[in-house]
Interface confidence: low
């Protein structure tokens, strides 16, 4: 049974759930259909359009697809709770027939004194409290069950858990007489994890973490540890996975240096070393024993942390992250761009390349944004002709084990999608920028002369003529 | 072909070591966690150990607790039990198995290797 | 631990005639839907092969006389019509918590 996996199913219960093991990977697309990838590996576009529409045939017929939200459950474990005390959380969407369990960890920046944490309470209390939070949620993106919207995983659990620790996803101290605000971003995680076990998960066969931004640093500085609860609860057969959006920073250096004052302008790396302190933060083991007490700061860079992790993950991000701009005192106010901030932006997507070269399944468009999977057109963006459902429909393929040992890629599906062309929105399917003042939405080549690009010197390295370039970028090609 | 093939039983008195390999052949062998089952002559299954596939976690029965540690090198293909402070009660055929990844049941066995204590 | 209980421990059987085999565990092996209970034949001289995994799903090559029930603690493995390469003894196991226990075998074996 080892070569060709079909979907068929055995015997009259669903099948298999957990036994004891974690292994990367066996991502069938689409798992409830009895179908044999075999025959289709030459024609998988128009395969897949036949999925799609055989999944939105059969759509009405599922009474619990109708309801597209995702229901809010405050933990049954108040002791485990957001920055002021009152109760995380976690929001569910069931798929019964499905063994994947999608959990998005939300983003939102971090705080990490009683100053800028107050500053949060007092301007972002949805971020540090769950007294406020709505009932429902519509699941958008990598969470939305409309195979249309994501036709990657739209049959899977979807949890959405909010980000309501400041910390990273990393704490692990409570509030008390000291400590004013409560960090447990990493306790939130893992009891989220306890409570879904009674609720399906411990059926699961993928177990998908991830995130965006401080969500998807979450993704990197949690994954392993979730895999080893899983495994310590007697669930070693969930594998666990993560996928890491818009969560990989550099800890470069600032384009202008600023002292430490807020959240935005404070360097990564003090404002990280600062939050550990202040959160009791944790980060993975192996990473940790890579560095001497008091340097732990250095696993919530993704370069740094990757290499020490068990898990697969998969790692998304913008090659001009809008994040790692603002932290690197980068503010494109639409002022042109003087020369040397330009290069220090080129720059930027040059050693952010660099470091995803030994990421084997890694996405990154050379665009200016931020975050990408739970938004609505999150499938629009392509790198290398592919899109990013794609990729990580590749990536679950390559974790299966019907390609046996082979660690090349496979034929038509690849994994490791980096843009190499070496400026902001050089890749024509990023997404739209609009003027920041007028809000008109404005080409490539618009975009580049507002941003101070010389088109001479955009062109060259392309070997093409300026006119030449302007007229690809104006018909987006 | 999927193979399971274990090797370095024997025989070995009370008090003494063997070390087990199994070689996997045919499959992801680093995708899937792997036990130790035995069988003492004319008795039933025993399950002895288990590892994880990127061997961060290990279980043991309790009959073997402390004596016995389970390895594997993932670049080899091969699983291994270092057994030691052997007893009488520790005579069985040894097989390795693969344990699939849909619930704690062993899809693939070895053919077993035989570990006799005596004096 | 979880105790298995099979019966019976050895079970004659004519060519062709059905055979049902039981299997008891000492608290419930089922959760969120699943039941974690598998079954295998060890023909004589061979290794032990799984036939059912999960209570009731049939392992790819295993002849679908073979069949499997039963959720919570009781199990049931049923051979539709018992041929020759039947012969061996048929083990229970469950994987619901460490330490993963088998039964203590049926032999079945031809009248």
């Known amino acids: 049974s080892e070569g060709r996996k079909t979907w068929r199913r055995r015997g009259q219960q669903p099948p298999p759930p957990p036994r004891t093991e974690a292994a990367p990977a066996a991502g069938q697309p689409v798992e409830s259909f009895p179908l044999d990838f075999t025959a289709v590996e030459g024609n998988m576009d128009s395969f897949m359009a036949q999925v799609k529409s055989l999944a939105q045939s059969l759509y009405p017929c599922s009474a619990q697809q109708l309801n597209e939200d995702l229901r809010l459950h405050l933990l049954l474990n108040t002791s485990v709770t957001c920055n002021d005390g009152s109760p995380a959380g976690y929001y569910l969407k069931e798929s019964r027939g499905s063994r994947r369990w999608l959990l998005f960890l939300e983003g939102g920046w971090y705080c990490f004194n009683r100053e800028n944490c107050d500053s949060r309470y007092d301007t972002m209390r949805r971020l540090m409290s769950s007294r406020d939070w709505p009932r429902t949620r519509t699941g958008t993106g990598i969470l939305s069950s409309q195979p249309e919207e994501n036709p990657y995983w739209w049959n899977a659990n979807m949890v959405f858990i909010p980000y309501c620790s400041s910390d990273v996803w990393s704490g692990a101290s409570s509030k008390s007489e000291k400590n004013e605000y409560a960090f447990m971003g990493a306790l939130i995680i893992q009891e989220v994890v306890r409570e879904l076990l009674g609720r399906g998960l411990s059926g699961a066969k993928v177990l998908l973490l991830a995130g965006s931004s401080a969500g998807g640093t979450g993704v990197l500085l949690n994954v392993d540890r979730v895999a080893e609860q899983l495994e310590k609860l007697g669930y070693p057969a969930i594998q666990v996975r993560g996928l890491a959006d818009s969560g990989w920073f550099l800890d470069n250096k600032q384009y202008r240096h600023t002292d430490c004052v807020d959240t935005i302008t404070c360097a990564p790396t003090e404002a990280i070393r600062r939050g550990i302190r202040y959160w009791n933060g944790v980060v993975p083991e192996r990473c940790r024993r890579q560095f001497q007490e008091g340097e732990e700061w250095n696993c919530f860079f993704g370069y740094k942390v990757y290499p020490t992790l068990r898990c697969p993950v998969f790692v998304v991000q913008w090659l001009f992250d809008e994040a790692q701009l603002t932290v690197d005192n980068v503010h494109l106010t639409g002022q042109p761009v003087q020369e040397g901030l330009r290069l220090y932006i080129q720059n930027l997507g040059r050693e952010l390349r660099h470091t995803l070269k030994d990421v084997p399944a890694s996405f990154a468009p050379a665009c200016l944004s931020h975050e990408i999977i739970i938004r609505s057109h999150w499938t629009d963006v392509q790198v290398k002709g592919t899109s990013l459902p794609r990729a990580l429909h590749c990536w679950d393929r390559s974790l299966h084990d019907s390609h046996k040992a082979s660690k090349t890629p496979l034929k038509g599906c690849p994994v490791h999608l980096v843009d190499s062309c070496p400026w902001p929105h050089c890749n024509p399917s990023c997404p739209t920028v609009r003027d920041q003042f007028t809000g008109q939405e404005m080409n490539v080549a618009q975009f580049l002369m507002h941003m101070g690009f010389d088109m001479q010197t955009v062109a060259q390295p392309q070997g093409l003529e300026p006119s030449e370039l302007l007229g690809m970028l104006s018909n987006g090609s | 072909e999927v193979q399971l093939v274990e090797s370095g039983g024997g025989l070995v008195q009370p008090g003494g070591s063997l070390r087990l390999s199994c070689a996997a052949s045919?499959?992801?062998?680093?995708?899937?966690?792997m036990n130790w089952v035995r069988q003492a002559p004319g008795k039933g299954l025993e399950w002895v150990s288990y590892?994880?596939?990127?061997?961060?976690?290990?279980y043991y029965a309790d009959s073997v607790k402390g004596r016995f540690t389970i390895s594997r090198d993932n670049a080899k293909n091969s699983l291994y039990l270092q057994m030691n402070s052997l007893r009488d009660e520790d005579t069985a055929v040894y097989y390795c198995?693969?344990?699939?990844?849909?619930?704690?049941?062993?899809?693939?066995w070895g053919a077993g290797t035989t570990v006799t204590v005596s004096s | 631990d979880i105790v298995m209980t099979q019966s019976p421990l050895s079970l004659p059987v004519t060519p062709g005639e059905p055979a049902s085999i039981s299997c008891r565990a000492s608290?419930?092996?089922?959760?969120?839907?699943?039941?974690?209970m598998h079954w295998y034949l060890q023909k004589p001289g061979q290794s032990p092969q799984l036939l059912i995994y999960?209570?009731?799903n049939l392992e790819s090559g295993v002849p679908d006389r073979f069949s499997g029930s039963g959720s919570g603690t009781d199990f049931t493995l049923k051979i539709s019509r018992v041929e020759a390469e039947d012969v061996g003894v048929y083990y229970c196991?469950?994987?619901?918590?460490?330490?993963?226990?088998f039964g203590a075998g049926t032999k079945l074996e031809l009248k």
């Open positions: 045919g499959f992801t062998f680093s995708s899937y966690g």
């Open positions: 999960l209570a009731s």
């Open positions: 608290k419930s092996v089922s959760s969120s839907g699943y039941s974690y």
């Open positions: 198995s693969r344990q699939n990844w849909d619930g704690g049941y062993f899809d693939v």
């Open positions: 196991q469950h994987s619901r918590a460490l330490p993963l226990t």
């Open positions: 590892i994880s596939s990127s061997t961060v976690t290990t």
